[in-house]
Amino acid sequence: QRFAQAQQQLPLESLGWDVAELQLNHTGPQQDPRLYWQGGPALGRSFLHGPELDKGQLRIHRDGIYMVHIQVTLAICSSTTASRHHPTTLAVGICSPASRSISLLRLSFHQGCTIASQRLTPLARGDTLCTNLTGTLLPSRNTDETFFGVQWVRP
Amino acid sequence: QRFAQAQQQLPLESLGWDVAELQLNHTGPQQDPRLYWQGGPALGRSFLHGPELDKGQLRIHRDGIYMVHIQVTLAICSSTTASRHHPTTLAVGICSPASRSISLLRLSFHQGCTIASQRLTPLARGDTLCTNLTGTLLPSRNTDETFFGVQWVRP
Amino acid sequence: QRFAQAQQQLPLESLGWDVAELQLNHTGPQQDPRLYWQGGPALGRSFLHGPELDKGQLRIHRDGIYMVHIQVTLAICSSTTASRHHPTTLAVGICSPASRSISLLRLSFHQGCTIASQRLTPLARGDTLCTNLTGTLLPSRNTDETFFGVQWVRP
């Protein structure tokens, strides 16, 4: 109820407070390194307010500077597993439109089983963000271990 | 002086810019895995603007989507220490009210001595966040190595 | 175009939405552990809206609470390299004015090749942030692997 009231008081859409927090749905088929995400109140604590999902990838709806953050934990993992399967790397980037394709954030697991990071980056309406996990290890689907989100910060 | 002026110009409470950054006070007694936090200008660079501390745990005062972040560094640690005492795991979750109890963010140290992460999550007035460190290792009380905070992002 | 419109609608300067995201320019000369940063649209996805660079160090222009974040990846690195060259430590702090000098955030690499973290901290106009990398290993200059930024959160 208080959420609804607050949204009446503040025209959030005009303020541009776009925000999304996603949980892992599944990995891609062979040769597709992308992680596929899902979000929505029915799924627990994930949500999309502004951005949308397009075949499991996050599409931006408002120009601006965004804080992008991610955490990925490998599913069956110990430091020896991680080092044996090295390199396992996660990259977050703009994958479409092709003209704006760029890697925004990249991390390797080395001897760890979790990576987590965040950065500020300009994004434009229509940019689709992809998260590529290279290597043979599978990410955990636990919602407290693997998640991906964006937060609009300013125009 | 500029802080005071800014607060007169912007009714921060109505905007809902609740924010807190805490430093470690101490670990719990045996069988209590919770970390106990402290905050306030007298303690250095920690603060609470909106949220409150309840027996060392952070209680939320305003509904909304929050960015939750944490860094914990182990006090006496090398990669061999960390792996010898594995699993040492940190979990951040809502611990009360019991009806809303859930793990929000979880990380293991594996061969590292520091974990750091952040995520967006909906929180409601009255939610108390607990940070549980399982394992026998002591976290550093240095304010630049171990800290925990939340930032209100939108309703 | 939409960026320009948005800026007309919202007097961002009065709102105080200062924000910066920097990429690594170079390391310092011997005996200078500081990383030197650069930012601006000509360099890719780095930018400064409010804060300024002073000889490669970030200077704050507006009092407030900021979210400070950083990721540093070592250039030629494996878990064995990292552990052999231990301790390699990154510290972010206020380095001037001298009266406000303090370490804000500190991380060691141990057996990893990347550190990433973030924290909320009060900063004042004129504060200069320095990022000190101690040890013999060189940081990667790739813009998706090494970056440093701040975001004004509230007065």
């Epitope: - | 026998t136 240095n142 | 000098s101």
Partner: antibody
């Protein structure tokens, strides 16, 4: 009342291993946040921090002496033992033990010390 | 490891003098610093903890200040019983490290 008492040989030969014991009373080493440190002082020289052990068995050693030191505590939690291998005449010093009552309370660091024990290294 | 550099290593002073001893840390140690006094043949005695907090029972002529990397121990008016050696100790990160000591001698 809190006391710490060091004991061990007065004289050791070069290349031998030194074993020192710190016996504590008036407090228990059962709290994970509590610990005992060994510190030494060669005659006429400065204090040198050697090693620390917490009740949960976490240990830290002086970097320069790490390869020669081992710190441990006995199961009764009343004794902390320091062993130092390959003794040399330069290791001649008074060896002290001191306590940290609570890692998270800086006012409790090294509030109590033992009287020290002088160890000479000579053939 | 954090290096602690204490200066001067020795000094001569007279009763009633104001004495200042400094300690510099190789990296920021916040306020995690203690000062100890040691007299010949005696156990070190803690004077100051947390950089500036006076140990109970220690006379108020002793004071500590500083934070980060620069620290000072001040004796406002030297008394005969203050002639001793003084050590700083960083308590920020394990392994802890002492400064090299400052011997305060009678002028």
């Amino acid at each position: 009342q809190v006391t710490l008492k060091e004991s061990g040989p007065v004289l050791v030969k070069p290349t031998e291993t030194l074993t020192l014991t710190c016996t504590v009373s008036g407090f228990s080493l059962s709290n994970a946040r509590m610990g005992v440190t060994w510190i030494r002082q060669p005659p006429g020289k400065a204090l040198e921090w050697l090693a620390h052990i917490f009740s949960n068995d976490e240990k830290s050693y002086s970097t320069s002496l790490k390869s020669r030191l081992t710190i441990s505590k006995d199961t009764s939690k009343t004794q902390v033992v320091l062993t130092m291998t390959n003794m040399d005449p330069v290791d001649t010093a008074t060896y002290y033990c001191a306590r940290i009552r609570d890692y998270y309370d800086i006012s409790s660091y090294y509030d109590y010390w033992g009287q020290g024990t002088l160890v000479s290294v000579s053939s | 490891d954090i290096q602690m550099t204490q200066s001067p290593s020795a000094m001569s002073a007279s009763v009633g003098d104001r004495v200042t001893i400094t300690c510099r840390a190789s990296q920021d140690i916040s306020n995690y610093l203690a000062w100890f006094q040691q007299k010949p043949g005696k156990v070190p005695k803690r004077l100051i903890y947390a950089a500036s907090s006076l140990q109970s029972g220690v006379p108020s002529r002793f004071s500590g200040s500083g934070s980060g990397t620069e620290f000072t121990l001040t004796i406002s008016s030297l008394l005969p019983e203050d002639f001793a050696t003084y050590y700083c100790l960083q308590l920020n990160s394990f392994p802890f490290t002492f400064g090299g000591g400052t011997k305060v001698e009678i002028n």
